[in-house]
Interface confidence: low
């Protein structure tokens, strides 16, 4: 949006579409440029030229807050925004008023204005910014602190969310979120946000407000989890009847209405969007909740948030499935409806949630709630392996350092001179409709960073704690994933985005990949064991993990994913005429299985799966695992090979072409 005077006057522009939607906890760069035809304005021969004055402000609800003012190379920042807003290119480029904002909070939504004054000239441009997403706390159905790191991530996924990052929890805390329950975050740390420190909730910060941390924890330890729900394209709605519904009846009613029971993540997003209902209803995980947006004493104790009905006064357990409540349904553009059996029928393994947003008050509850919600929950100090205040210090607040990236820094795909082997057919056979020149395999070496207990060791692969790190690229093209898309891509493939430590361990074990990829801490890196021209990066001719530092989340790269262990088996499927992608899906389903994800194939490879035949995977890619390299089978290195459509290692094969399949059950 730009507002300017006629052609010969000062003009300001923000070349971004409005509204600009950004994720909670992310950083945001808003470009703002001005053209000043007057250039130095001199008021009189004896006075110095006037410099342009830059002012950034945020306008919300008729109120304007000045974020910063800059002139003559000096920047003055509003004390409330110190360390949050900067002008990264000023004064190096005097006409560049680009603003960078760290750790976006929901409260940062609004209209941002870039205004430039020069003498009597004045011009401005505005941009609406919408911060998306909400952080919420999850608890398993049975009792508190029962989720290991893997189950914590799955708990979030099963409730239309992903595990939150430290930045997202920090942003939520700054927005007012507090919860005295330790929960996993995406970087494998355990934290909880406290505004009013009290007995049992001091953590590592004593009597100071802030996000408490236990540091990085072993993945087998159990806590609750903090999840992040980004947005939903559909709609949450209530259904009721004179008798209300049992859990099963509620599920049926939603189905009758062309919908299904909503997840907790969906209800949180609806609440964030203003949903208010003083009546408790069933959700997909068998929890009973209700969203309160307008505080009133007889409805959630004058508190806002998504309220939860518990079976026990200590905020554990869910109501009996035969008790009666409304149904909270969801209809919208999901990728796939959750099958009826998804959440099971109860018991210890059911992953579910505790979501009292502001505890500490005895709550009058709606109809059919007998136990009441308990008063403020506390951190239990009896965990066997550490005290409430462990020695691990909390890292400094997140900051962004963007190093200069030379044009040559981005690694290019190496020229593959060797002829691509063709493991997409049985030996000495060609695949109908697919000739040798049309498909190319990648020589990705994938290093195993763990081995499941009792699994066969992959020859030549080191045994390290952890799992398997692998490079992932969507079929379409190279460097196409934003930071958020990268995280989602790993999750979709049955893995999580790798941490710098995991990539470093993989590099030390011999992993090499000349492709820049996102990591968990929003840095972009790639591991090079044998430096060569297009893969020099920031390390000249020394081996090592190259890094571009922390990158803006809107930039696009590939991603490095990490898969830990396989809970099930990957098996190779074939038949004489082989399968189209669709037929492969159908065949796996007929075997009570699904097409394996890329992550599952990597995990199976790490446990010894070796197949010289490429097979369909769930994302439409074609890959094959090589444990024992042989000349006719993927070159001289172990790893998971990918068959690409184009020689530059991009493009998925035609889904109607015929290949084998890898199934998972």
């Amino acid at each position: 949006v730009e507002v300017s005077e006629p052609d010969n006057s000062l003009s300001v522009s923000i070349p971004e579409p409005s509204p600009l939607r950004v994720l909670l906890g992310s950083s945001l760069t808003i470009p703002c440029y001005f053209i000043d035809p007057m250039h130095p304005v001199t008021t009189a021969p004896s006075t110095a030229p006037l410099a342009p004055r830059i002012k950034w402000s945020r306008i919300s609800k008729e109120k304007e807050v000045v974020l910063l003012v800059a002139t003559e190379g000096r920047v003055r920042v509003n004390s409330a925004y110190q360390d949050k807003v900067t002008l990264p290119n000023y004064p190096a480029i005097p006409s560049d008023a680009t603003l960078e904002i760290q750790n976006m909070r929901s409260n940062d939504s609004g209209i941002l204005r870039c205004e430039v004054m020069h003498g009597i000239e004045d011009s401005q441009a505005t941009l609406e910014v919408v911060v998306k997403g909400i952080v919420f706390h999850y608890r398993a159905i049975s009792t508190r602190y029962t989720l290991d790191f893997d189950r914590a991530q799955r708990a979030c996924l099963q409730n239309s969310a992903i595990i939150a990052t430290p930045e997202q929890l920090q942003a939520a805390y700054e927005d007012g979120f507090h919860q005295c329950d330790a929960g996993w975050l995406a970087d494998q740390t355990v934290r909880y946000p406290i505004h009013t420190p009290r007995e049992g909730c001091y953590g590592d910060k004593d009597e100071f407000p802030g996000v408490r941390t236990y540091g990085i924890r072993d993945t087998n330890e159990t806590y609750d989890v903090y999840c992040f729900a980004e947005e939903m394209e559909g709609e949450v709605f209530y259904a009721t009847s004179p008798e209300k519904f049992t859990f099963q009846e509620a599920a049926n009613e939603c189905r009758r209405l062309g919908a299904r029971l909503a997840t907790t993540g969906q209800l949180y997003l609806a609440w964030q969007g203003g949903m208010d209902m003083c009546s408790a209803g069933w959700l997909a995980d068998r929890s009973v909740r209700y969203p309160i947006s307008k505080a009133r004493p007889n409805c959630g104790g004058n508190l806002l948030g998504v309220r939860t009905v518990y079976l026990h006064a200590n905020q554990t357990g869910y109501p009996d499935p035969s008790s009666r409540y409304d149904a909270i349904c969801y209809t919208g553009e999901d990728f796939v409806d959750i099958p009826e059996s998804f959440f099971g029928v109860g018991g210890e393994e059911d992953i579910t949630i505790q979501t009292v947003t502001w505890p500490d008050v005895e709550l009058p509850l709606p109809r059919n709630i007998t136990e009441g919600e308990a008063r403020g929950s506390v951190i239990l100090t009896a965990k066997p392996d550490f005290e409430v205040s462990p020695t691990a210090p909390e890292p400094e607040e997140p900051f962004t350092f963007v190093p200069e990236v030379r044009a040559t820094a981005f690694p290019e795909v190496e020229n593959r001179t060797e002829e691509a082997t063709r493991p997409w057919a049985f030996p000495r056979e060609s695949t109908p409709g697919l000739g040798a020149p049309t498909a190319f395999t990648s020589e990705d070496l994938v290093v195993q960073v763990t081995l499941a207990p009792g699994a066969a060791e992959v020859p030549g692969q080191p045994r390290l704690p952890g799992g398997v790190v692998f490079h992932y690229r969507p079929g379409s093209s190279r460097y196409s994933l934003t930071f958020e898309e990268a995280k989602q891509a790993c999750l979709r493939t049955g893995a999580i985005i790798a941490s710098p430590e995991q990539l470093q361990a993989a590099y030390e074990a011999g992993y090499e990949q000349c492709d820049a990829g996102w990591l968990q801490d929003q840095t972009v890196r790639y591991p090079i064991v044998s430096p060569r021209t297009p893969c020099v990066g920031d390390k000249d001719s020394s081996p090592g993990v190259r890094t571009y530092g922390v990158r803006p989340p809107s930039e696009t790269y590939d991603v490095y994913c990490y898969v830990d262990r396989l809970e099930g088996e990957v098996f190779f499927a074939t038949r004489l005429e082989q399968f189209t992608f669709w037929e492969a899906q159908e065949f796996c389903e007929s075997q009570n299985a699904t097409l394996a994800t890329t992550g599952q194939l990597y995990a199976a490879w790490s446990r010894g799966l070796d197949k010289c035949y490429a097979g369909w995977l769930a994302d439409g890619s074609l890959r094959y695992p090589i444990v024992t390299p042989r000349p006719a089978c993927g070159g001289d290195k172990p790893g998971v090979r990918t068959v690409y459509l184009y020689p530059n290692q991009t493009g998925l094969l035609d889904p109607l072409s015929r290949h084998h399949a890898f199934c998972f059950r």
């Epitope: 559909g234 189905r255 209405l257 299904r260 209809t331 919208g332 999901d334 189209t580 669709w582 899906q585």
Partner: nanobody, 124 residues
Amino acid sequence: EVQLVESGGGLVQAGGSLRLSCAASGRSFSSYAMGWFRQAPGKEREFVSIISWSGGSTVYADSVKGRFTISRDNAKNTVYLQMNSLKPEDTAIYYCAAGRLYRATPRPADFGSWGQGTQVTVSS
């Protein structure tokens, strides 16, 4: 697998309406996402609309949003495409498809069963 038969195509003037039907035979119609695609002469098959197996979720291509409506009657094993404010550029063979996947940007490979198509011609 389900077998699909489209009907309801024909010649219509610009601005007019048509309602396409797709009758499915076979088991468990209600467990399939149903989609409509179209193919104009010399062009690739393009996505028009999809409806989830429950019927509660729909997606439309930008080119037909606000003009076309997809619906289904699981009791009758039928999916419909109501086409209003038709334009000459809507001229194509319209195909009905059934699949077990549902996503916001459907692709032909998601669908395992296809009808033989019905011709829609919009004259100016």
